[in-house]
């Protein structure tokens, strides 16, 4: 069930998965709703006991989807918009008065105002946020300076109260971004460096997805299910360089190279994998098995479950079974398989609740 | 592959699960064969250049089961005996000299030696270790003060050097309690005490070897797959009491209750779950799918892969399949399944290889 | 969203009596072990009266004789009358659905599908 209001004074009891720093309670709500398994949150206003804890926003998670509330004052509680039905975006235009987002502080310039530092921000291949110091800032050698911002995961490591500076946000996710946008995916290629993270993936364009809306990731690595390498198998590689293309292309049969598509315009989804794979099985943490009549059946099963985050449908027992298939609902701690095997004969696939967070945007 | 040996100077970088506290590198390494995901570990000696990680004791997980290894002075790091083909006990009867176990000290009172005050600890219910002020202690009206403690994990909050203080563990787990051992299940019938953890469990048997090993479990309730509530069936409460004994006994039907056996002498293992559940299926975190004949290999596969903790054995392919049917091999956070599932044809079970570490004991 | 909510605590004198009342939402008694449990400050949460789904009732000696459990299922609503009230029964008083124990001595933390409500206070004056 979809519940958007928040809860004031209320803080949820347990489940804790991480806490990262936001501005509001409003952003909170849209972090734990992009993140793979967060369902609930608690915000801590700066009108909460310990200033140590202002602005922090407790993901959380639950099997019931329900946490027991607790009275606390300044804290304010809410659920994901995973359990809705309307679009969603990650674009936050937002500016934030009198606060200082912090980060790693990369590059400092002079701009007009901040505006125009947002738009540098937005045009940086790594900013993820940045902080204005404005024309009244006391000390007088930092005013009118932009600091751009990034951070290990895209959030703020802390957020404080500063007088007389702004903040805000990268808006490459309200497509905004004049960066290039490379769709090309490169065959028998490998990119040599810097790897962010590693995720199990059953195609390169599942793999581009992923880096799509991974904070830090402009170009990745696939390795196809036929690469020597066992091991290596399925696996999607997250890359970043510091200029921010890839400084070494090394040629590999059965493996393919890409770039994020952060900077584009999309006129397809780009965070939700609808397609189907056929002869292939998702491993992850099993949420429950059910019967149902096929693999679309499957797909809507999962999609429906709101913990459910890809499947596997096997149609083994069809022919037993009144035409019904066994359809294994999963779960990992990232979102994706933790494992993929092929020739087994299942038809495996993800949840369609993503489609919903894709920025309804033309081609750029 | 087995290794015994401990590594001097060597911290084994990444695979944290979580960092308890142990007297020394020995001990830590069967606090981590004991936990039901660590591999590896790393234990920071008083030689190591930051006090205030002294005795801590990291236990690790690696899919790869292995990790980085990096020189650091005052590490010691290793593996698990799971890995290992030897018979095991958590029984450990070493007095630590001039070391202060840390942990909630909920009865003091005067011994004449460290003997006694370990003899005490071992027949308290609650008490998982002691710190023992000798005669020679500074301050002379804690001198002889036999302290018995007790902590959420059974393991110390924290190790501090202090002169002139021994400590030591409960001696249970060495089948050395003289409190009483009650091995009657009772059926019909719900404790409703405190609930200090619950987990998915196939049977009444399991759920007591569950609470056995559990450092604070001393009764339990377990729900069957009959009871009228979906959400409880096949539930495990773990219990505790202040008094050491159910205050409430509840007549319900398709409940079980009992004790832990932490104080009996056993003649049958109580740490492995040995039995087949027919007509069952484990759901937990997917390690491999792999085929085999027959449920007793798939249990055989399981018991020797090593991050394997229960299975399920599907066996409706078997008439395609060479006679072989599939062997999911599956692990959770606990070890125990986070669903069970009826009806649906799958054989379940355990791996065996939670069997070397049962005490080897007379009946008492 | 399965909603338990109390009514009916607040200041009584040694002697005097309340009724307290918990209704649920999003949730049926009819097939539910439901319980009054309570916690004062700086103890653990106990359990003060049960009465599970056949219609079995269970209290706690400390309250035997003075307090009385009932139901209206109709009105999806439990009912803790309360006679006699001492000082010792000022506490924190929660309804509890299919919670068999509290956890940790809290009267919050619940297991998978056991539910709590906020509690009401209830202050016996001497």
């Known amino acids: 069930e979809c519940v958007i209001k928040l809860f004031s004074d209320i803080y949820f009891q347990g489940g804790d998965i991480t806490t990262v720093y936001t501005p509001n309670a409003k952003h909170c709500q849209v972090v734990c709703t992009y993140h793979p398994r967060c369902l609930l949150f608690t915000f801590m206003a700066e009108s909460s006991v310990d200033s140590t804890k202002w602005f922090s926003c407790i993901l959380k998670d639950s099997v019931t989807e329900s946490l027991p509330k607790v009275n606390m004052t300044g804290a304010i509680s809410g659920y994901s918009f995973k359990q809705c039905p309307h679009q969603l975006s990650a674009c936050n235009k937002d500016i934030y008065v009198d606060l200082d987002m912090q980060g790693m502080n990369y590059n400092g310039s002079v701009t007009k105002n901040a505006q125009e530092c947002q738009e540098r921000c937005t045009n940086d291949a790594h900013c993820h946020f940045f902080t204005y110091a404005t024309r009244q800032f006391p000390s007088a050698e930092h005013r009118n300076i932009c600091l751009l911002k990034y951070t290990q995961t895209g959030a703020p490591t802390g957020i404080r109260k500063l007088k007389k500076v702004v903040s805000g946000f990268s808006l490459k996710s309200c497509a905004l971004s004049n960066l290039a946008c490379i769709r090309d995916i490169f065959p028998s290629t490998v990119f040599a460096d810097n790897n962010i993270d590693s995720v199990v993936a059953p195609d390169a364009l599942v793999c581009r997805r992923i880096c799509t809306h991974h904070p830090n990731c402009l170009f990745f690595t696939f390795f196809s299910q036929e690469w020597p390498k066992e091991s290596h198998r399925n696996l999607c590689l997250l890359k970043t360089s510091e200029s921010g293309l890839p400084s070494t292309r090394i040629h590999k049969n059965q493996a393919l190279s890409g770039f994020s598509l952060q900077n584009c315009r999309h006129s397809i989804p780009v965070f939700c994998h609808s397609s189907f794979y056929y002869d292939t099985d998702f491993l992850g943490e099993e949420l429950d098995i059910v019967d149902v009549k096929g693999h679309e059946a499957c797909q809507k099963m999962c999609t429906s479950a709101i913990r459910c985050q890809f499947f596997t449908y096997s149609s083994s027992q069809e022919s037993h079974n009144k035409g019904k298939g066994t359809c294994y609902l999963k779960l990992s701690s990232n979102g994706s398989p933790t494992k993929i095997l092929h020739g087994r004969g299942g038809i495996s696939g993800y949840t369609l609740r993503l489609c919903k967070m894709d920025n309804v945007c033309t081609t750029k | 592959e087995c290794v015994i040996k401990l590594f001097s100077d060597i911290y084994f970088q990444g695979g944290d699960i979580t960092t308890v506290y142990t007297p020394n590198a020995k001990h830590c390494q069967v606090v981590c064969t004991y936990h039901p995901r660590c591999l590896l570990f790393t234990f920071m000696a008083e030689s190591s250049v930051d006090s205030t990680k002294w005795f801590s004791c990291i236990l690790k997980d690696s899919v790869t089961e292995s990790l980085p290894k990096v020189n650091m002075t005052g590490a010691i790091s290793g593996y698990s005996f799971k890995q290992c083909p030897h018979q095991l006990s958590a029984c450990n009867k070493d007095i630590y000299v001039d070391l202060d176990m840390q942990g909630m000290n909920y009865n003091g009172s005067v011994t004449k030696n460290a003997q006694e005050c370990q003899e005490r600890c071992t027949n308290d219910a609650h008490c998982h270790f002691f710190t023992y002020a000798t005669r020679q202690f500074p301050s002379a009206e804690h001198r002889n003060i036999c302290l018995l403690k007790y902590t959420q994990t059974g393991a110390p909050t924290g190790i501090r050097k202090l002169k002139k203080v021994v400590s030591g563990f409960s001696l249970k787990s060495c089948a050395l309690s003289n409190l009483a051992c009650i091995r009657d299940i009772f059926p019909s019938t719900v404790f409703a005490d405190n609930n200090i953890d619950s987990v998915v469990a196939p049977d009444a048997l399991v759920c007591r070897r569950i609470c056995t090993h559990h450092p604070n479990c001393l009764f339990f309730t377990f729900f069957s797959q009959e009871w009228p509530k979906e959400s409880h069936r096949n539930l495990c409460l773990l219990k505790t009491s202040e008094s050491g004994l159910p205050s409430t006994r509840i007549h319900k039907n398709q409940a079980l209750s009992g004790f832990s056996l932490q104080n009996c002498r056993h003649s049958i293992p109580v740490f492995c779950h040995s039995s087949f559940y027919y007509d069952t299926d484990f759901l937990g975190e997917e390690l491999d799918i792999v085929d085999v004949k027959g449920h007793e290999a798939c249990q055989k596969m399981c018991t020797s892969a090593i991050r394997c903790q229960f299975f399920t054995y599907s066996s409706s392919q078997e008439s395609h399949n060479k006679g072989k049917g599939t062997c999911y091999l599956k692990l959770s956070s606990n070890g125990s399944p986070t669903k069970i599932l009826h009806g649906r044809g799958g054989i379940s079970g355990y791996t065996l290889r939670l069997c070397k570490m049962d005490n080897v004991c007379t009946t008492k | 969203q399965v909603q338990l909510v109390e009514s009916g605590g607040g200041s009584v004198q040694a002697g005097g009596s309340l009724r307290l009342s918990c209704t649920a939402s999003?949730?049926?008694?009819?097939?539910?072990?439901m319980a009054w449990y309570r916690q004062a400050p700086g103890n653990e949460c106990e359990l003060v009266s049960t009465?599970?789904?056949?219609?079995?009732?269970y209290y706690a000696d400390s309250v035997k004789g003075r307090f009385t459990i009932s139901q209206d299922n109709s009105k999806n609503t439990m009912y803790l009358q309360m006679n006699s009230l001492r000082a010792e029964d000022t506490a924190v008083y929660y309804c509890?659905?299919?919670?068999?124990?509290?956890?940790?001595?809290?009267?919050?933390?619940?297991?998978?599908?056991?539910?709590w409500g906020q509690g009401t206070l209830v202050t016996v004056s001497s």
């Open positions: 009465i599970t789904s056949d219609g079995g009732t």
């Open positions: 509890a659905a299919d919670q068999w124990g509290s956890a940790e001595g809290d009267c919050t933390s619940s297991y998978p599908g056991g539910y």
């Open positions: 999003e949730f049926t008694f009819d097939d539910s072990d």
